[in-house]
Interface confidence: low
């Protein structure tokens, strides 16, 4: 037919921090390069239909249906979804296309189903539908990482039960602290199953999929390192495998090591000894510790000795269940304008935490840093001094956990009036909250000195913005203040803020803001 | 390194029935997962099923009981058995070992 129009769908994808798209924009923030649908006519239709490919999204994603159309004139068009109709505006792009689109954030399966778009143009009318599923992600898994010893060979290979199966790598570094942070220079990763060289400083195991990306450290205790102040501390849940590595090095090979559970020999078969030279010829030994399945009894002081080093000790902690350990009271702060702060939890939880912080509906990426006394500490600083009420929450397997924080921001009150035929209302958010005082402008006092003590109501926090505090003042018109100026003055510890009122007869008020 | 041939590909009437095979060479075939995968024009791949080393299967539950996944470790080969085929299922197929993909191999399947 030739008066059908040219029609191109796309979808648009939006990364997950883009908070500006709307709900049903005509004007998307577009994140992603778009992706045609294709848009093709059905064939045996009644009436003239266009089918764009199929769209699958994953939960929580935001996306944009949007139609370009090539037609002459002017275009109309309406959405339905679920027999309910949309508001749909098109507009026109430089090429001079109509362009119609449906924003979806934040994906549910509520959402998911066909979105009928009916379009009428000068020439004709035509159908545009689109399928939206969620992806199917129920079957994905994603677990941390286990070691287990490789069968007659001292290596150790590292597994992940996830599906789909995941990439395992190795992520070795060979100097101290900081400096094995994860895209630091000192970090190796090898991404193999099966790791040999076990003498290394810091030895992680990481596997990533489609979910992401866990990783479990090997518990190592250091004999040539001055043992921490407080005694490392290792958890596991019912059934898990556990391995610990005892290293030391000394300047010849006339040393051992053994492992002990609260004074007692390991049992044959829960350990296996590696040792080489290194470069400068000492002489490096590894003692593993290992049970292939833990039980509540295998909780205890596993000590490492030596012949040639001071002996040092692990608490191996066996819970039935995981658990976040933190205090969930709500914690209120109260900063200057530029002063620098930041939230911080500290938390001990096993296993380790997935977590998020939150405000104003919006989440931010949570970071999470270990501490030496077996505690970690997650701390936001992005908070731009924003007062109000802050999130942190927290989940692993088997828990969660959330705590509140609310922000003040100390600063001088800053005041809006608004005024009926009955009163006169003063509004204003600084911090600590302000008290108010009302005063004539009259003849006698040009000044407003005149105080008004009559008719005069303080709500004091009314109302609650995302945590953040607004106090007003209303003053009740009487005959005697009719026809006169008043101002409003709230006042806190930071200063002075007034706004003069002209109490007239009904109608639009004048408002003179006087700091 | 790991190299990986799809085959079995072609076109097949709805209702009728294909086997995939995944050939690998080196030799951590037998210690690794296999996957297959799919991608159908103008979609993106999806997962269509899991062998683990030990033999253990997955798959994504739209397909199971259509489509069966094997391997014979002994000839370094995975195979995907898909009957009572539909059109929906016209894609190219993929298998992965780690992070090693093959070339992929066509399937059509007509109304």
């Known amino acids: 037919n030739q008066d059908l129009p040219v029609i191109k769908c796309v979808l648009i994808n939006h990364k997950n921090n883009d908070s500006s798209v709307g709900k049903s924009s005509s004007y998307p923030m577009v994140s992603e390069s778009p992706e045609d649908l294709g848009c093709a006519l059905r064939p045996q239709s009644s009436g003239t239909v266009y089918e764009a490919a199929a769209v699958e999204v994953d939960v929580s994603a935001s996306i944009t249906l949007q139609v370009l159309v090539d037609a002459p004139g002017n275009i109309s068009c309406l959405w339905v979804f679920k027999h309910s109709s949309l508001n749909c505006q098109p507009h026109f792009d430089l090429q001079n296309r109509g362009v119609v689109s449906m924003v979806i954030l934040k994906m549910t399966e509520t959402q998911a189903g066909e979105y009928l778009l009916f379009i009428q143009s000068e020439a004709t009318n035509y159908t545009i539908l689109f399928t939206v599923s969620i992806r199917n992600t129920l079957l994905y898994t994603l677990r941390r990482p286990y070691f287990r010893k490789m069968e007659n060979q001292d290596a150790l290979v590292c597994i992940s039960e996830s599906v789909p199966e995941p990439i395992v790598e190795w992520v070795l570094c060979d100097s101290q602290g900081e400096s094995c942070k994860e895209e630091s220079p000192a970090v190796v990763k090898k991404e193999e199953k099966v790791l040999h060289e076990l003498f290394g400083t810091d030895i992680r195991c990481c596997a990533r999929n489609e979910l992401g990306r866990e990783c479990t450290r090997l518990f190592t205790i250091d004999l040539n390192q001055t043992p921490q102040t407080t005694l490392p501390q290792l958890f596991l849940k019912v059934g898990e495998p556990l391995w610990i590595r005892c290293k030391a090095v000394h300047v010849n090979h006339g040393f051992g090591l053994t492992w002990e559970l609260e004074n007692k020999a390991l049992e044959e078969g829960n350990y296996f000894e590696m040792s080489t030279y290194s470069t400068n010829r000492t002489m490096i030994r590894i003692l593993f510790a290992f049970v292939s399945s833990v039980a509540r009894n295998d909780t205890g002081y596993y000590t490492c000795s030596s012949s040639k080093h001071p002996s040092q000790s692990a608490l191996v902690t066996i819970v039935e269940k995981g658990f976040i350990n933190a205090t969930n009271s709500s914690e209120d702060y109260e900063i200057d304008q530029y002063e620098e702060f930041c939230f911080s939890v500290r938390f001990k939880a096993y296993p380790q935490i997935r977590c998020t912080w939150t405000f104003s509906r919006k989440s931010f990426p949570c970071e999470q840093k270990g501490l030496d006394n077996g505690y970690s500490i997650s701390k936001f600083c992005n908070h731009k001094h924003q007062p109000g009420e802050y999130i942190f929450h927290a989940e692993n397997d088997d828990a969660q956990f959330t705590k509140m924080f609310t922000l003040n921001i100390r600063r001088k009150p800053q005041v809006l009036a608004e005024a009926s035929a009955s009163q006169a209302s003063c509004f204003s958010d600084g911090y600590p909250l302000p008290s108010w005082t009302w005063k004539k402008c009259s003849d006698k006092s040009p000044n407003c000195t005149e105080e008004i003590t009559e008719g005069v109501w303080n709500r004091k926090a009314n109302r609650k913005v995302f945590g953040q505090w607004v106090s007003s003042s209303t003053l009740n018109m009487s005959e005697a203040i009719k026809g006169f100026l008043v101002k409003c003055c709230a006042y806190n510890s930071l200063g002075t803020s007034c706004e003069t009122i002209l109490l007239n007869s009904p109608g639009p008020f004048p408002f003179i803001q006087d700091n | 390194q790991v190299q990986l041939q799809e085959s079995g590909g072609g076109l097949v009437q709805a209702g009728g029935s294909l086997r995939l095979s995944c050939a690998a060479s080196g030799s951590t075939f037998s210690r690794n997962y296999i996957d297959w995968y799919r991608q159908a024009p103008g979609k993106q791949r999806e997962w269509v099923a899991q062998?683990?080393?030990?033999?253990?299967?997955h798959y994504e539950p739209s397909l199971k009981g259509r489509f069966t996944i094997s391997r014979d470790n002994a000839k370094n080969t995975a195979y995907l058995q898909m009957n009572s085929l539909k059109p929906e299922d016209t894609a190219v197929y993929y298998c992965r070992i780690l992070d090693y993909w093959g070339q992929g191999t066509q399937v059509t399947v007509s109304s």
């Open positions: 062998i683990t080393s030990g033999g253990n299967t």
